[in-house]
């Protein structure tokens, strides 16, 4: 006969390691008992546990708790163990000597290798800010062994570099992602990938692009300067821009105060019926943490007396 | 710093069996495994297996098996990989390199040249 | 086993160029698993990327790795008359361990 095992076993810290040892022999033969032993444990082996055939499982007072046998059925050649919640320390080879009758002893040696999952964490760089050159928008760490793989996915245009540090048996990496802000980005997601053997699937971290930028301003309502007459009601001015953050508004008469009556409701101007006293320059001010514009109109309320009258006099001139 | 130093070149019959050297330097040589790998002339790297320097433990490629024999001595920090029954085709430089999952230090190689 | 084959098996560039070298595995391997190394004439391989994308120590940032799953990438960026050699990538996450036959990176 001979004995099945594996010449590595991995497992993830904190979960159980099958440790394998099967017998394979001719028909008749039985086994005895099954001892195992760290089998690298300095001044010679470390005694794990004994299966017995008759007696069941012993396990040795350093792994008491720590091994067991795995779950029925049970196969009466099968002498494999489980070693319950692995640590970094019991990375190292163990051996499983098998007594059987008639063919005697046999013994085989696995190596133990633990795999520590990473728990990364992402690091927003400074505030981006529309204008900047290439700036760091988030670095992403993670700390593993063997060494994690650190990429990012996002449909923002930048660059990535990365760099590593081992210790023994185990890194820590950290990748870097680099963009130059522009407005597009903002609300973008860029998300962090960590892969590793000792996880199930890659971990995501996401974090969400926040570009401060202040857009040109405008004012909307002037398009027909024909409806700006006295009389007419309901007329208003609307500034327009956008930002991150949002920005605020304000109005202001450059040629005097604003005229009483005048409302103000944050990027609106409203009028009540027009006389030509509403006639001016008109400013919209838009600001917000990153910076403000400007953007001025002239409103000339046309009196169609007045204008009339000029009529008749341009007639009489001709 | 880290340093691994590998026995001269050495010229054997067929038939016969060599013995490679590899002293570890400028780290604890109990800590980490040592690989022996091989490379033909103009050929890649061949993997041949693993010693723990800590307990003596090994496992062996199983093109391998039956004729390479790795062992050490951790009073010396040295590290020994013998292979017997040699032929023509072990010609090739042998490499021991420390493993620290992926091979972060290698010596300096050792030319076996097996010839009648 | 898991064997690694490499492409091109010979790279032909001049310096300053881009080399960008590949390694098919024949069987998924954890990226965390994947190393390249250089070899230069009557040296011994040196170890350039680890975990599939991390340069090790003192190698200098224009060597990059990249891919996952069965694809893998080695980019040499700006290539320096001292990065012509033969690369390897190897697997250490399964037994045997196992090498890619090598691509030779030589001057145009």
């Known amino acids: 006969g001979e004995l099945e095992t594996s010449d590595v076993v991995t497992v993830v810290l904190g979960q159980d390691a099958k440790l394998p040892c099967f017998y394979r022999g001719d028909s008749g033969e039985q086994v005895g008992q099954v001892a195992w032993a760290r089998a690298d444990a300095g001044e010679g082996a470390q005694e794990l546990a004994l299966l017995h055939s008759k007696y069941g499982l012993h396990v040795s007072p350093a792994y008491e708790g720590r091994v067991e046998q795995p779950p029925p059925p049970r196969n009466p050649l099968d002498g494999s163990v489980l070693l319950r919640n692995a640590v970094q320390a019991d990375e190292g080879e163990y051996e499983c000597r098998v007594s059987t009758f008639p063919a005697g002893s046999f013994q085989a040696r696995l190596r133990l290798r633990v795999l520590v999952p990473p728990l990364p964490s992402l690091n927003p760089g400074p505030a981006l800010e529309e204008g900047q050159g290439l700036t760091l928008a988030a670095s992403c760490t993670a700390e593993g062994s063997p060494a994690p793989s650190v990429t990012w996915d996002t449909e923002v245009k930048g660059t990535t570099s990365s760099r590593s540090f081992k210790h023994s048996r185990s890194a820590a990496v950290t990748s870097e992602f680099h963009l130059v802000p522009s407005r597009s980005m903002n609300g973008q997601p860029l998300t962090c990938v960590v892969s590793h053997p000792g996880l199930l699937q890659d971990q995501r971290i996401t974090h969400i692009l926040h570009v401060s930028f202040l857009a040109e301003a405008s004012v909307r309502g002037l398009e027909d300067q024909n409806l700006w007459h006295v009389g007419r009601e309901g007329a208003m001015l609307k500034c327009l821009s956008e930002g991150q953050p949002p920005p605020s508004y304000n109005w202001t008469r450059l040629d005097g105060p604003l005229p009483s009556g005048v409302r103000v409701d944050g990027d609106t101007l409203g009028f009540p019926p027009l006389t030509t006293e509403h006639s001016g320059i008109y400013v919209c001010h838009v600001s917000n943490e990153f910076s403000s514009r400007d953007s001025q109109v002239t409103v000339d309320v046309l009196d169609p007396q007045e204008d009339s009258g000029k009529q008749v006099d341009l007639v009489s001139a001709s | 710093q880290v340093q691994l130093v590998q026995s001269g070149a050495q010229v054997k019959k067929p038939g016969a069996s060599v013995k490679v050297s590899c002293k570890a330097s400028?780290?604890?040589?109990?800590?980490?495994?040592i690989h022996w790998v091989r490379q033909a002339p103009g050929q890649g790297l061949e993997w041949m297996g693993w010693?723990?320097?800590?307990?003596?433990?090994?496992n062996y490629a199983q093109k391998f098996q039956g004729r390479v024999t790795m062992t050490r001595d951790t009073s010396i920090s040295t590290a020994y990989m013998e292979l017997s029954r040699l032929r023509s085709d072990d010609t090739a430089v042998y490499f021991c390199?420390?493993?620290?999952?992926?091979?972060?230090?290698w010596g300096q190689g050792t030319l076996v040249t097996v010839s009648s | 086993e898991i064997v690694l084959t490499q492409s091109p098996g010979t790279l032909s560039l001049s310096p300053g160029e881009r080399a960008t070298l590949s390694c098919r595995t024949s069987?998924?391997?954890?990226?965390?698993?994947l190393a390249w190394y250089q070899q230069k004439p009557g040296q011994a391989p040196r170890l350039l990327i680890y975990?599939?994308?991390n340069r090790a120590t003192d190698i200098p940032d224009r060597f990059s790795g990249s891919g996952s799953g069965t694809d893998f990438t080695l980019t040499i960026n700006r290539l320096e008359p001292e990065d012509f050699a033969v690369y390897y990538c190897q697997q250490y996450g399964s037994s045997p361990i196992t090498f890619g036959q090598g691509t030779r990176l030589e001057i145009k």
């Open positions: 010693i723990n320097p800590n307990s003596g433990g090994t």
């Open positions: 400028g780290y604890t040589f109990t800590g980490y495994y």
């Open positions: 390199a420390r493993e620290d999952w992926d091979f972060d230090y």
């Open positions: 975990g599939a994308s």
């Open positions: 069987q998924s391997v954890s990226s965390s698993y």
